[in-house]
């Protein structure tokens, strides 16, 4: 029987007695920055090349005995998880190991930086196929380590890292907090977040996805045929590095942004019990468990989108929060969320030649989040159309007037501290889907995009009685690009996308009477690209 | 994930460039900043990564490192350049007393300095 973790990441069509998905990542090289490894273990023999790179601190304590099997334990296990013959994810991947952690599993930021530089220099000297770098380590937030990861990622390298085992916000650790890195949390056989002693997996907006990370069987450095169970976000990251190697082997031209979007798209959704996470982190933490794609080809036609949360703005009156997409992603919509409900909306604005999503706190608010919807849309030309607050009582409206441009998202932003709570809802006139509407006191921003074959439609779901959450989902074949609440629902805390579902959150229903103002409408903009679909069919 | 609006804890020593016959003021009057790990037990004081501005060439990095050593020596401090970075980030790794941070932050081309810290297997 195959170990639970390999079964979990394997789509049903691959499942047989043996875990043998097609093409095991043979075109990809995976660099492992970790402890020393036992390269003659039968799981990884001939698959891992030990480089001469070593940069580790002295072991702590006078009583420490440097025992080879202990020194190699972490790295050997992870190499086995990535590419092991029996218990590995990408059995065809070749690996290179760099020693940046000592026999106690301890290293330094500087040693890791020098290791990353070594990889970059190796890449320049001898360019090979796609590179994946696995960083199964974590330290405190480090500006320099994050910067180095960013540079390496922009050189075309895929970096995968452990979220950390501190049962804490992953944004407080590096390299987990680096936006360019794929950050992986750990789940167990019951799809619960992993507990490790008194701590456990990290969580929060800096985690991209989760993967199996408890009771993972892999190569043991105790002997060349031994196996052992290890646990941690390192093991989870090793699974994702293996999946990434498989995907890149099947499609070597995939960019980091494309790979990340695919990892998210093919993940199991909403299987993690979020009650384990602190309440304020649940909405920020992705409910995704990594899996291999059901087939190695044919995903190209899809319009892929993901949700990116900003850091919290902080409570000051003029505080703002900014969410950004990756360099080769398009910002298709922008929304905001505040637990107190006190916010002044959000807007899309240009910054350094790219659109960003900025949310505004309101007086007396505890702070806001900006939520960007970031999509892969080749040959896209997107712009923001803004309508200032309207004079008329009809409310503010803005539409995409350029020929061939379609509406992908609506945002609204207001200067007044409290948007007239007594005002009735403004309803969208039927038959005008390419239009954003809002309060007359608000400026409205429409995200308008032109891309070959792009088509979008608006989908609404309204509930007359007050409810804490209203959702509307895009149907199969369509991708959610925009998520907002229809104006007039003054008690709305905000809107955000979870996978293909638009979620509008309201204040606790017990505090809002069931007046007409209790009506909540979630508005989703669903898009698809016929051009991508046609291109994919032509390839096949 | 974490961006410049990040909510991480950091200690920033923003030191205005003072006249110091030996140190050039940073370009455009910008102030180099000092960062250290928010988790005290993980700090490794005495070793620092000096990160230089993005377009700094290797030769300039080496010159800046030598300048730091010379200025430190004039003040009676021993320093050791452990590594000069190029390829990913321009800069250098230096073993020195924390007393020299103010001096180092005023060196030309310096973007920021980060105290070394521990990382751990996860």
């Amino acid at each position: 029987s195959i170990p639970w973790n390999l079964e979990r990441i394997t789509p049903p069509r691959y499942r047989a007695d043996e875990y043998q998905p097609p093409d095991g990542g043979s075109l990809v090289e995976v660099y492992l920055l970790d402890t020393s490894i036992q390269s003659d273990h039968r799981e990884i023999e001939g698959r891992v090349m030990v480089t001469d790179f070593e940069n580790v601190p002295e072991e702590d304590g006078t009583r420490f005995h440097r025992q080879a099997s202990k020194c190699d334990s972490h790295g050997t296990h992870l190499a086995g998880v990535v590419s092991g013959r029996d218990a590995g994810v990408a059995k065809g991947a070749s690996m290179r190991s760099l020693r940046v952690l000592n026999c106690q599993g301890k290293g330094t930021v500087s040693g890791t930086l020098i290791g990353l530089e070594f990889i970059r220099k190796s890449q320049l000297v001898q360019p090979v196929g796609p590179l994946v770098v696995l960083l199964p380590l974590a330290g405190g937030y480090s500006r320099v380590l994050n910067a180095a990861c960013q540079r390496l990622a922009r050189a075309g390298v895929v970096l995968v890292t452990a979220a950390g085992n501190f049962r804490d916000d992953a944004c407080l650790y590096s390299p987990a907090s680096a936006p360019e890195v794929i950050t992986v949390g750990a789940t167990n056989a019951q799809d619960q977040p992993v507990t490790l002693g008194t701590l456990g997996t990290n969580f929060g907006r800096c985690v991209d996805l989760f993967a199996p990370g408890e009771d993972i069987i892999g190569a043991s450095s105790d002997c060349s045929t031994c196996f052992v169970s290890q646990s941690g976000t390192s093991q989870a990251a090793a699974h994702v590095a293996g999946i990434a190697a498989m995907m890149l082997s099947a499609e070597p031209e995939l960019t980091l942004a494309e790979l990340r979007q695919r990892l998210i798209h093919f993940s199991a959704k909403d299987v993690i019990n979020e009650a384990w996470f602190p309440e304020d982190q649940r909405v920020l933490t992705p409910n995704l468990v990594a899996a291999l794609p059901p087939s190695t080809h044919g995903a190209g036609w899809q319009l892929f989108c993901r949700t990116v949360w900003s850091a919290h703005s902080g409570p000051t009156r003029m505080a703002t929060a900014v969410a950004r997409c990756a360099p080769d992603e398009e910002l298709l919509s922008c929304s905001s969320f505040s637990r107190s409900g006190k916010r002044r909306g959000e807007r899309m604005e240009a910054q350094g030649g790219k659109l960003v999503c900025r949310a505004h706190n309101a007086f007396g608010g505890e702070g806001v989040y900006a939520i960007a919807r970031c999509c892969l849309l080749p040959q896209a030309n997107c712009s923001v159309h803004t309508a200032p607050p309207a004079e008329a009582s009809m409310g503010t409206r803005v539409h995409c007037h350029q020929q061939g441009h379609v509406l992908t998202g609506c945002s609204s932003h207001w200067e007044v501290e409290d948007l007239g709570t007594h005002k009735p809802p403004v309803l969208r006139p039927r038959g005008q889907p390419n239009q954003c509407v809002g309060h007359r006191e608000a400026s409205i921003h429409a995200s308008c995009c032109h891309a070959p074959g792009l088509e979008c439609k608006v989908k609404e779901h309204g509930i007359p009685a007050p409810q804490e959450q209203v959702t509307v989902a895009c149907e199969e074949g369509w991708t959610l690009t925009g998520c907002s609440a229809l104006p007039g629902t003054s008690h709305v805390l905000g809107a955000y996308a979870v996978d293909n579902t638009c979620v509008v959150r309201s204040r606790d229903v017990s505090t809002t009477g069931s007046t007409s103002e209790g009506a909540v409408t979630a508005v989703a903009i669903c898009c698809r690209s016929r051009h991508l679909a046609q291109a994919s069919q032509e390839l096949q | 994930q974490e961006d410049e609006d990040g909510d991480y804890e950091e200690l920033v020593l923003a030191l205005r460039s003072e006249e110091d016959g030996l140190a050039e003021a940073p370009e455009h009057g910008t102030t180099a900043t000092f960062h250290r790990c928010a988790k005290d037990p993980w700090r490794l004081p005495g070793t620092y990564v000096v990160v230089l501005k993005e377009e700094t060439h290797l030769s300039q990095s080496e010159r800046t490192a030598r300048r730091l050593q010379a200025q430190a020596a004039r003040r009676g401090y021993l320093t050791k350049i452990l590594h000069v970075f190029h390829g990913l980030l321009p800069g250098f790794l230096v073993k020195m007393s924390g007393d020299l941070l103010e001096l180092a932050l005023k060196l030309p081309h310096v973007d920021y300095i980060e105290e070394d810290s521990s990382v751990f297997a996860q």
Epitope: S1, P3, D60, K70, S73, H74, D86, A87, Q104, G105, K106, N165, L196, G197, L199, E214, D215, I216, I217, S220, D222, C223, T225, C226, F227, V228, S229, Q230, S231, G232, S234 | S118, F120, A121, Q122
Partner: antibody, heavy 130, light 107 residues
């Protein structure tokens, strides 16, 4: 699914010897510590011995130290209990069990997290009598 | 060696009852305690590990609590299948001891 099958039990005279075997399936066998647990007729469970994955560490209950030896053969996916100098009080059903546990790292230390004995064999009976 | 003492030795209860079994350690074992269920002629079955974590496939009516030296196993609503003998087991630096067992029988 992992299965454990004990064999080698039987009737033996006091002072005699017996070797119990436990056959396992899959790589999961070699990934965990393994234990022998016994249960005397009408009595409770008593842990006897355990062994690390690679056989490098072994522990015994005081009453069997120096008489019993636990071992394992990774290649054969088998666990053994060599019982010498048997006594009447060693009469029991002997179970082999998998000690499910996992190792993890925290800030430079290597820790063991124990789950318990999650897979058991059906038991083999040892009777020590003259 | 650490001694484990279970109470009561025998417990009579009816279907639907809430029952609690206690286990005391002679010294602190942190949370390193497991609970097992054994039916006549069968091997034991793991129910709870690390004092309060439910083993996969075990019904949620079983729960464990405690740390240090005092631990309890609770069955929230007894089912006919739950009448069996229950054992606690401590784990301390790779050597184990079991409690003497609690026989749960039909009233």
């Amino acid at each position: 699914e992992v299965q454990l099958v004990e064999s080698g039990g039987g009737l033996v005279q006091p002072g005699g010897s017996l070797r119990l075997s436990c056959a396992a399936s899959g790589i999961t066998f070699s990934s965990y510590w393994m234990s022998w647990v016994r249960q005397a007729p009408g009595k409770g469970l008593e842990w006897v011995a355990n062994i690390k994955q690679d056989g490098s560490e072994k522990y015994y209950v005081d009453s069997v130290k120096g008489r019993f030896t636990i071992s394992r053969d990774i290649a054969k996916n088998s666990l053994y209990l060599q019982m010498n100098s048997l006594r009447a009080e060693d009469t029991a059903v002997y179970y082999c069990a998998r000690d499910r546990g996992t190792y993890y790292y925290t800030e430079g230390s290597y820790n063991y997290y124990y789950y318990g004995m999650d897979v058991w064999g059906q038991g083999t009976t040892v009777t020590v009598s003259s | 060696d650490i001694q484990m003492t279970q109470s009561p030795s025998t417990l009579s209860a009816s279907v639907g009852d809430r029952v609690t079994i206690t286990c005391r350690a002679s010294q602190s074992i942190s949370s390193w305690l497991a609970w097992y269920q054994q039916k006549p002629g069968k091997a034991p079955k793991l129910l709870i590990y690390k004092a309060s974590s439910l083993e996969s496939g075990v019904p949620s009516r079983f729960s464990g609590s405690g740390s240090g030296t005092e631990f309890t196993l609770t069955i929230s609503s007894l089912q006919p299948d739950d009448f069996a003998t229950y054992y606690c087991q401590q784990y301390n630096s790779y050597s184990y001891t079991f409690g003497q067992g609690t026989k749960l029988e039909i009233k």
